[in-house]
């Protein structure tokens, strides 16, 4: 009875289990009842990094100097080339497909340390009481406005991305002659 599953490093084809090609090699022909899987090494500037049945190897990544990229680690038949950025520049992602002078801190984050020639911008989340509403490579988190010091009240709470909104004190004088004490509307006035 033909197999329905194969062992590790094998694949099922034409009701039989064939060996996968090892990393660094591509498939030329599947095995048969009488022959083993035929594999060939990848060419120069090509690679395959897994046990596979690929008929084509992948091209090594090109580190484009026009994008500020240079080779950090040359590729082999089993590994891709690893790119990095020119000195003083920073990769935009783990894949390092382009370079920026320095990254910015998004809204809700402030700059903890400005970028240097060797290290990129270091961001930190804005703690309670602070906010940042911009993307920046130099601005820290700003403290929420203190409404009290302006003789105002908080109308809308602040977040890590927005400042508080202050507004006038919505209050009435106490009609009971309470020495000019300010009483919130609807309190102590007999209003429902």
């Amino acid at each position: 009875e033909p197999p329905t599953a194969c062992r590790e490093k094998q694949y099922l084809i034409n009701s039989q289990c064939c060996s996968l090609c090892q990393p660094g090699q591509k498939l030329v022909s599947d095995c048969t009842e009488f022959t083993e899987t035929e594999c060939l090494p990848c060419g120069e500037s090509e690679f395959l990094d897994t046990w596979n049945r690929e008929t084509r190897c992948h091209q090594h990544k090109y580190c484009d100097p026009n994008l500020g990229l240079r080779v950090q680690q040359k590729g082999t038949s089993e590994t891709d080339t690893i790119c990095t950025c020119e000195e003083g520049w920073h990769c935009t992602s783990e894949a390092c497909e382009s370079c920026v002078l320095h990254r910015s801190c998004s809204p809700g984050f402030g700059v903890k340390q400005i970028a240097t020639g060797v290290s990129d911008t270091i961001c930190e989340p804005c703690p309670v009481g602070f906010f940042s509403n911009v993307s920046s490579a130099f601005e820290k988190c700003h403290p929420w406005t203190s409404c009290e010091t302006k003789d105002l009240v908080v109308q809308q709470a602040g977040t890590n991305k927005t400042d508080v909104v202050c507004g006038p004190q919505d209050r009435l004088r106490d009609p009971g002659g309470g020495g000019g004490r300010l009483v919130p509307r609807g309190f102590g006035t007999g209003d429902p």
Partner: nanobody, 116 residues
Framework: EVQLLESGGGLVQPGGSLRLSCAAS???????EMWWVRQAPGKGLERVS?????????YYADSVKGRFTISRDNSKNTLYLQMNSLRAEDTAVYHC?????????WGQGTLVTVSN
């Protein structure tokens, strides 16, 4: 295509002044944080100064605080760096940069030489 064209560099004596300009095109200048970055001969990049899109907040490296002033004119799409009390160690190529600044948009810069 982003273009940043720096000008205003030159040879100046220690203690002298220069005003650098950066004419920007290919992007909405008023929406971007802008930077001045310099590179002294044989040295790495040094971030000198920055300004927010509205021109209301600025940053200065300790090495230039009190001597340099960054400003911008959003109506003219131009960034400025006023440099006073110049020192020999300010000698460098000065580049303006937007945020984010991609390598391919990096300009030639303008050379400032401070020497007797």
């Amino acid at each position: 295509e982003v273009q940043l064209l720096e000008s205003g560099g030159g040879l100046v004596q220690p203690g002298g002044s220069l005003r650098l300009s950066c004419a920007a095109s290919g992007f909405t200048f008023r929406d971007y944080e802008m930077w001045w970055v310099r590179q002294a001969p044989g040295k790495g990049l040094e971030r000198v100064s920055a300004i927010n899109p509205q021109g209301t907040r600025t940053y200065y490296a300790d090495s230039v605080k009190g001597r340099f002033t960054i400003s911008r004119d959003n109506s003219k799409n131009t960034l400025y760096l006023q440099m006073n009390s110049l020192r020999a160690e300010d000698t460098a190529v000065y580049h303006c940069a937007k945020l984010p600044m991609f390598f391919e948009d990096w300009g030639q810069g303008t050379l400032v030489t401070v020497s007797n």
